[in-house]
């Protein structure tokens, strides 16, 4: 891996600057895709922050980014203005570049924040140069809130700062009024004032009357050393604007603003709902707006103007529908900080909020809602309902558009057809069965997030309270006893105070469930069973005839039983008993009670006359260890010879 580029970034104070390929450019000898060249921020900036243009600019600090994102101009450094003035400040970012299998490369990015740089975002090089508003024929103080060169002083090391000042030399005087310092007028012979005089409130502008035309003065500001000596250091030449206001002027009144809602990457007109003022003195064309700070999610443009952003527009532009917001790819909400003026009153701050709507949202359903059988209810979670768009939507709201058929949704214990993502996340939204005739249910919701909706179906299944055997393979051709070691709903019986019932829904593919006669006196052989109870299991009355797969040589195979389990006061549940079978092996100890073994095996043992045991299973029934497990086929013979 190699790292090129200047590794220096120059940023205007209080502004946002993208990292570029001139600043930071990584490459690899293998020609790696820029998407795979990953930077990790080891130490973030101290004077600002690093963020991604298309992610939440108010969220957590950026931790990782790729070279591809640098190329796209999506990695931004934002300088945060400090409270104390400065002339130049330095920041650093420590990064680690990685792209396995290459070795990581450490890099430092130096950031210079300087008033020296030419900044389109702020035309003045001074800490403040905001201009002045004065009523016609009157006078007003020019304070440090309007004009402040403290940042020039900040370029001097602090021990010597007290001995320095800033000298403002007026190069062009006001044409419609006078500048006074300590009540003495400035003129060609005395064209100077100092930062210290400005700080002491000694600088005044007095308007001469006779109209409300604009006024102002031009100046050059530079450092002055001890005893008035000129010293080398930062300097600037600028103009200070003075606006004269009609004394009868009524200032414009901003009206309440509705946020603009727009899908990302699209364009929408700004209307009076977003920007309007009440001003009886001014025509819409006289009410001017200036963008002081723009968000990162798009820009304002004028129809018929250039393609780029506009920073000045009028109420007439808004009223005629000429002003539009153009959203970029960002999904983040943002705010325009504007100043509005009718040209005769001091500017008023206004804001225009822009909410970026997702072009679409999706309800993520990661799993059906599983309801424990004995409980009959379960809380919804993000596993069942979560809305995502271009970001997660924690503010999502849900409305039932089709309720469940066998139960209801409750919020805080009462039936509810509407709820929020927050209520889901806090476990307050519960589905409860009210009709215990189905093992599954579903409901349909409409999700609403940031003005966009989507529907989804949540499936509900009941998880059987059933302990199912999970041992080794069972012998093909044998009949094994189906008892609580294999299927046990005893806990469900205890929880419901009822005898659970089983209904055979499907399987086994090779074999059948049979009722085993209790004694020789009972008529007939084994009866096919489709329903049975927990009591039948406990009584040892059931057998599973394990068949052989047809049409092929005996070999191990898998099989299953699908059952529906019912009990009083709870929903039914579907469960399956999955088992493996293999050709009977007389030498193998099977871990289940066998009621009979395959015919061929009996022939070999000299018992051709007995095909199915019809009497009591003998010691097997009460033996804690299945007889076959005691010693293979000989154990089976020993246990069954008297039957």
């Amino acid at each position: 891996l190699s790292l090129e580029g200047s590794r220096t970034l120059t940023v205007c104070p209080g502004s946002v600057q993208p990292l570029s390929s001139q600043t930071l450019r990584a490459s690899s000898s293998a020609g790696t895709d820029p998407q795979l060249l990953l930077y990790r921020v080891v130490r973030g900036p101290q004077l600002g922050r690093l963020f991604h243009a298309q992610q939440d600019s108010t969220g957590e600090a950026l931790v990782n980014f790729t070279q591809a994102e640098v190329y796209a101009g999506n990695i931004l450094y934002e300088h945060e203005m400090p409270t104390e003035p400065f002339w130049e400040a330095h920041d650093t970012l420590e990064l680690q570049l990685s792209s396995p299998p290459a070795r990581d490369v450490a890099a430092t990015l130096a950031v210079a924040v300087s008033f020296e740089a030419a900044c389109p975002q702020r035309p003045s090089h001074l800490w403040k140069n905001k201009g002045l508003w004065v009523p016609e024929g009157q006078r007003a103080k020019i304070t440090m809130a309007a004009l402040d060169a403290s940042n020039l002083l900040a370029s001097v090391p602090s021990p010597q700062r007290l001995e320095h000042d800033v000298l403002f030399q007026v190069t062009q005087f006001p044409s419609r009024g006078q500048l006074l310092v300590s009540e003495e007028p400035l003129h060609a012979g005395q064209p100077h004032f100092l930062q210290s005089q400005l700080a002491a409130g000694q600088l005044v502008y007095a308007h001469g009357g006779g109209g409300t035309q604009q006024d102002g003065f031009h100046f050059r500001a530079h450092l002055q050393g001890p005893a008035g000596a000129t010293v080398a250091g930062p300097q600037t030449s600028e103009a200070f604007a003075i606006t004269v206001r009609d004394v009868n002027e009524r200032p414009p009144q901003p009206q309440a603003s509705v946020p603009l809602r727009i899908t990302r990457g699209s364009r929408a007109p700004i209307s009076r709902a977003q920007l309007s003022v009440v001003d009886p003195d001014s025509a819409p064309g006289e009410i001017e707006y200036e963008v002081q700070r723009a968000p990162h999610n798009g820009f304002l443009s004028l129809v018929g103007g250039g393609p780029g952003p506009v920073t000045h527009f009028t109420q007439a532009d808004v009223d005629s529908g000429r002003l539009a917001f153009v959203a970029n790819g960002s999904s983040v909400a943002g705010v325009f900080q504007l100043s509005m003026s009718d040209g005769a009153s001091p500017p008023l701050p206004m804001s225009l909020a822009v909410d970026i709507l997702p072009s679409a949202i999706e309800v993520q359903l990661q799993a059906p809602l599983e309801v424990p059988q004995a409980l009959g209810r379960s809380s919804l979670s993000q596993q069942q309902l979560r809305v995502v768009s271009d970001r997660e939507e924690p503010e999502a709201a849900y409305r039932l558009i089709q309720g469940p058929k066998y139960g209801h949704l409750l919020v805080g214990g009462r039936p509810a057809s509407a709820f929020s993502q927050l209520q889901i996340d806090q476990g307050e939204v519960v589905f409860a069965f009210t009709n215990f005739s189905s093992s599954h249910d579903h409901f349909r919701v409409l999700a609403l997030a940031r003005g966009v909706n989507a529907s989804a179906v949540v499936n509900i299944t009941v998880r059987a309270l059933l302990h199912v055997w999970a041992g080794g393979p069972w012998p093909q051709g044998a009949t094994l006893r189906l008892d609580p070691t294999i299927l046990d709903a005893g806990e469900l019986a205890n929880r419901t105070g009822s005898v659970p019932h089983f209904r055979l829904l499907e399987g086994p593919r090779h074999g059948r469930v049979v009722r085993v006669p209790r004694a020789r006196t009972e008529p007939g052989g084994s009866q096919l069973v489709e329903q049975f109870t927990q009591q039948d299991l406990e009584d040892g009355r059931l057998g599973l005839e394990v068949g052989r797969p047809e049409g092929r040589a005996p070999s191990p195979t898998g099989d299953s039983l699908t059952l529906e389990l019912w009990a009083q006061g709870v929903p039914p549940a579907v469960a399956s008993l999955d088992f493996a079978t293999e050709p009977y092996n007389a030498a193998r100890p099977y871990s289940v009670a066998l009621l009979s073994v395959p015919e061929a095996t009996r022939m070999e043992a000299g018992k051709p006359e007995s095909s199915t045991p019809t009497g009591e299973p003998g010691p097997m029934a009460s033996s804690p260890v299945p007889a076959v497990a005691k010693g293979g086929f000989l154990g089976f013979l020993e246990a069954n010879m008297f039957s």
Epitope: G376, Q402, R414, A432, T496
Partner: antibody, heavy 112, light 107 residues
Amino acid sequence: QVQLQESGPGLVKPSQTLSLTCTVSGGSITSGYYWNWIRQHPGKGLEWIGYITFDGSNNYNPSLKSRVTISRDTSKNQFSLKLSSVTAADTAVYYCADFDYWGQGTLVTVSS
Amino acid sequence: DIQMTQSPSSLSASVGDRVTITCRASRGIREYLNWYQQKPGKAPKLLIYYTGSLHSGVPSRFSGSGSGTDFTLTISSLQPEDFATYYCQQYSELPWTFGQGTKVEIK
């Protein structure tokens, strides 16, 4: 808050169909979950008849199921009860309710 | 159907008394139980839902507790306006069913 108001004839002849309507104000019948009909025989306890839900599905008390129909008219924000083949045993005060709030009830007498 | 049995069927009490009414379900209904108050000639009013949650506007002297099959409505200090008939109702399993009522009379 939601308010409910029952309306319908107070006297119904035996074997005929009892019809009542509940008008909901202060809320929509497509947002509240259950819209129930409940009755109370004179001097007796409460008996749930059935409900219609926000999405129009129904459930009825098995003891009355064969004779009951509950329907709704979302445009009028109303839901209705029809009980067919009535007898004197159906004489009762009939309430509509969403359980949180109840109508004031209307007495229906079944008599020829 | 789930049977709801209230006890006592009626009770006499004085203003300021602590009154307890019980409701028993024929099988478990979790916490899905409402309590209502009904005065003569009036519709029932919901007091408590979900066993112990107080409905809006209901005085805090009313409280509910229980789970499964046994539930209790308690009036901590009986007021003159509390003389009425009280019903419990389960909403755990269809059909919804009510208790037969407990009449609270002035002693």
